[in-house]
Interface confidence: low
């Protein structure tokens, strides 16, 4: 699995989307887990409703919510009041019995609040983000959760 990078601003909400084949995963509940180390276990954060037909209902665990569009094939996770300690590796999972299939690997990056308008100093100058081989970035950097994709790394 390639890794998809989602960037959010500290203190704001970040939406992570995980597309999947709705037919292949028909009838399966979904989950959002946090990867503990590169090869460690994935610790469950939140999962969809126990009744698959009610998967569209948003379920919360603390500041993290999950909802599943089972017809459209999109799992959506919302991280509310994003904090620096939320940065890290996560997975969207499709559950069947005691097994879990990975739908998407996600790296959450937390940016400082852009309303902090202090000058970045002489070291930095604006530029365009270029290509990489392993993942891609989905920005969520405005208060309206405007998403725009940077080819930073493209998925293969």
């Amino acid at each position: 699995h390639n890794t998809t990078v989602f960037q959010g601003v500290a203190g704001q909400s970040l939406q992570v989307s995980c597309p999947y084949d709705s037919m292949k995963h028909w009838g399966r509940r979904k989950a959002w887990c946090r990867q503990l180390g590169e090869k460690g276990p994935c610790q469950r954060v939140v999962s969809t409703h126990n009744l698959w037909l009610l998967s569209f209902l948003r379920r919360w665990n603390g500041s993290t919510a999950i909802t599943d569009d089972t017809l459209g094939g999109t799992l959506t996770i919302t991280l509310r009041n994003l904090q620096p300690h939320d940065a890290g590796l996560y997975q969207c999972q499709s559950l069947h019995g005691s097994e879990a299939d990975t739908l998407r690997k996600v790296l959450v990056e937390v940016l400082a609040d852009p309303l902090d308008h202090r000058d970045a100093g002489d070291l930095w100058f604006p530029g365009e983000s270029e290509s990489f081989e392993d993942a891609h970035v989905e920005h969520s950097i405005s208060r309206s959760l405007l998403e725009g994709e940077i080819p930073f790394p493209p998925t293969s």
């Epitope: 960037q7 890290g88 940016l111 100093g121 930095w124 530029g127 365009e128 983000s129």
Partner: nanobody, 112 residues
Framework: ESGGGLVQPGGSLRLSCAAS????????MHWYRQAPEKERELVAL?????????NYAGSVKGRFTISRDNTKNMVYLQMNNLKPEDTAVYYC?????????WGQGTQVTVSS
């Protein structure tokens, strides 16, 4: 950035990047490189705060290590077992105020 130079194949270099003017510890930092006639490519990234989360391009995995010192506002790239194909200008990068920002770059040349 600093720490670049000429090194023989199999050698090592440590690149450093000093940042200022923003809350460094809250930002994910990246190292990119650009070889002549090639696109700029992401080499490594490190998460904010303690920097426990790292990710590497497949071509450098196991040879390069990214780290950061939030007390000094520094990010580093330790490069071991260098190969001629690692020759490039290396840049550190941060996404600041919603846009990518680049350092001035440091040249790394791997040649015998």
């Amino acid at each position: 950035e600093s720490g670049g130079g000429l090194v023989q194949p199999g050698g090592s270099l440590r690149l450093s990047c000093a940042a200022s003017g923003f809350a460094f510890s809250n930002y994910v930092m990246h190292w990119y490189r650009q070889a002549p006639e090639k696109e700029r490519e992401l080499v490594a990234l490190i998460g904010s705060q303690g920097g426990a989360y790292t990710n590497y391009a497949g071509s450098v995995k196991g040879r390069f290590t990214i780290s950061r010192d939030n007390t000094k506002n520094m990010v580093y790239l330790q490069m071991n077992n260098l190969k001629p194909e690692d020759t490039a200008v290396y840049y550190c990068n941060v996404v600041y105020n919603g846009r990518p920002n680049w350092g001035q770059g440091t040249q790394v040349t791997v040649s015998s």
